[in-house]
């Protein structure tokens, strides 16, 4: 039986050529997080595994960060960041939780890390 | 720019099924990813699911999860979403939509009210 929640970061927006930390958090479960994975637009960014730490994926180890906690920093963002970035917890006994975090990379100032925008 | 109609709605009791369908005016081959989302009376819009048209990689709500299925039909131009046992809370408008595109004018949706 499945009894936790995901909160994540939700909607957010950031500036081209910063940086953004996507977080989730799981709660009201005293399920083991044996993994993380954090997965962005069909493909594997980063691995946090509780036994042998974080592994990031080749191609994104220039621009991506382990941290804070389980979470991630991606760094020297561009447009094409955009999208849907998916935190996957994995868990025993429970099971996989899913979050989803949608990011929006905009070219001027007008970025607020955390604003609020029409999903998606 | 692909059109997008939601279709598949109706009424049905607790525990039984529908199958949504998004039909696009163009190929979705050129839509990297497609998603479901619904709107609950009162409530903000949320995300329910993906599916990657070409990896074909699919992500679901933890609401949903095991219950609903997504996919892709590349050659009808068309998304699915398989919805079984159905409970009282999925009642909602249902939208398709381009899930990695950040802001859209929405189309009508589709009603899915369930019934205890």
């Known amino acids: 039986m499945m009894t936790g929640t995901i909160e994540t970061t939700g909607n957010i927006s950031a500036e081209k050529g910063g940086s953004i930390i996507l977080q989730c958090h799981l709660s009201s479960t005293t399920a083991q997080v044996t993994q993380v994975n954090w997965e962005q637009q069909d493909q594997l960014l980063a691995i946090c595994n509780a036994d042998l730490g974080w592994h990031i994926s080749p191609s994104f180890k220039d621009r991506v960060a382990p941290g804070p906690g389980l979470g991630l920093t991606l760094q020297s963002l561009t447009v094409n960041d955009t999208g849907e970035y998916f935190c996957i917890y994995h868990t025993y006994p429970d099971g996989t939780y899913t979050g989803r975090i949608f990011l929006e990379v905009l070219e001027s100032s007008v970025a607020e890390h955390g604003a609020r925008f029409q999903i998606p | 720019e692909v059109q997008l109609v939601e279709s598949g709605g109706g009424l049905v009791q607790a525990g039984g099924s529908l199958r949504l369908s998004c039909a696009a005016s163009g190929s979705i081959t050129s839509i990297r990813s497609m998603g479901w989302f619904r709107q609950a009376p009162g409530k903000e819009r949320e995300w329910v699911s993906s599916v990657y048209i070409f990896g074909g990689s699919t992500y679901y709500a933890d609401s949903v999860k095991g219950r609903f299925t997504i996919s892709a039909d590349n050659a009808k131009n068309t998304v699915y979403l398989q919805m079984n046992s159905l409970k009282p809370e999925d009642t909602a408008v249902y939208y398709c939509?381009?899930?990695?595109?950040?802001?859209?004018?929405w189309g009508q949706g589709t009603q899915v009210t369930v019934s205890s």
């Open positions: 939509a381009n899930s990695n595109k950040p802001k859209f004018d």
